[in-house]
Amino acid sequence: CQSQYCADKARDGICDEACNSHACQWDGGDCSLTMEDPWANCTSTLRCWEYINNQCDEQCNTAECLFDNFECQRNSKTCKYDKYCADHFKDNHCDQGCNSEECGWDGLDCASDQPENLAEGTLIIVVLLPPEQLLQDSRSFLRALGTLLHTNLRIKQDSQGALMVYPYFGEKSAAMKKQKMTRRSLPEEQEQEQEVIGSKIFLEIDNRQCVQDSDQCFKNTDAAAALLASHAIQGTLSYPLVSVFSELESPRNAQ
């Protein structure tokens, strides 16, 4: 990445398309949910990030290479009754017309009698929606991410059975501290309450339907996180995700 412009703009929290390249580490992670190399584990001889081209490149069709952005699927279809299926997703009632991969397997409503098949690890996502709004919209959120990952997700529960969705107050970066000072004119210790600007949500992947219909399922959350980062690079995320991480051990400290 030769450009001084990109060196100056990297890691400033804003995605600059001119720097949104592998050489510039996707603008220092600004375009890729802070992940500087989603293809780090891809051992293909091809530069798979250059082959998101609406055609199948078998050398990139591995989990580590993000399944070639699912471009090798033989029967790539769109959900026929998308509005209906979105409205009835994960509502504990099986709608067979929605029980297909392209419709998100009706949020597993038709597979409640089947054993779960959890991928190893946890997806930890920061999204700029407050917890109450995210929980209210959780079915749409899980469906949107599941559509990108071609599998099903669920919100993880803690040891008490509570959903692991927590308020997110932002990073304590120098830029943000400065921003708070300029807008409030109060020393930090005088700030009565921190402002909730988003949510940190912990997700699990349940492959129980994916493994029946496909061989392109994520065995762990690492590649799933990387695939979401690649969608951020392409600008195809429908929710304001800020960062995505994968934790292969159970998170010890949720917040």
């Epitope: 804003i14 398309e17 709004q133 830029a175 400065k178 921003q179 600007i197 304001p240 995700l241 800020v242």
Partner: antibody
Framework: EVQLVESGGGLVQPGGSLRLSCAAS????????MSWVRQAPGKGLEWVSY????????YYADSVKGRFTISADTSKNTAYLQMNSLRAEDTAVYYC???????????????WGQGTLVTVSS | DIQMTQSPSSLSASVGDRVTITCRAS??????LAWYQQKPGKAPKLLIY???SRASGVPSRFSGSGSGTDFTLTISSLQPEDFATYYC?????????FGQGTKVEIK
Amino acid sequence: EVQLVESGGGLVQPGGSLRLSCAASGYTFSSYGMSWVRQAPGKGLEWVSYIYPYSGATYYADSVKGRFTISADTSKNTAYLQMNSLRAEDTAVYYCARHSGYYRISSAMDVWGQGTLVTVSS
Amino acid sequence: DIQMTQSPSSLSASVGDRVTITCRASQSNRRFLAWYQQKPGKAPKLLIYGASSRASGVPSRFSGSGSGTDFTLTISSLQPEDFATYYCQQYYISPLTFGQGTKVEIK
């Protein structure tokens, strides 16, 4: 309904200061970038500055760098443009405009305010 | 900075005419180009983004094409409400830059 409403314009002398406000409603304010764009009387559009409210990161046009400061208060869903050392050539209608892509300056401006007139004259 | 040059700067046309406005960038901005419509005393309105995608609520008579450095806005059949000034804008790299505008007037 997504809406942006500017205020704070007016007549100011050369060298003076003014602060413009842009109140946003109908969407998650911190998720989308915001720009100020100006239009001198009878002229075309000129981009002035950009902020991503979530991170507070900012960009400026060279013509205003060092004189103008963009900021955002996510608790008030409002973006600001603090204009110092004003010159006659800063006279324009100032619009705030929301960017359509989360955290991307590289996205089109899909919602615009009605504009507020700033006149710099002695 | 990327300079954006529109042509023509003004044109006269009649209702029903097909109108084409071109925009040339001084360097490639891939497809990171938008078109806006502005009527006197009003704020600009987004018509086209990504060089060819219509913004929501924009009539199908408006279409955009091009990539790299050369872009076109076409109004297939001019309607009375289309008489306005049109601006192209690149959003590939900061500073964001606009064309000088094309005024579409009634013949």
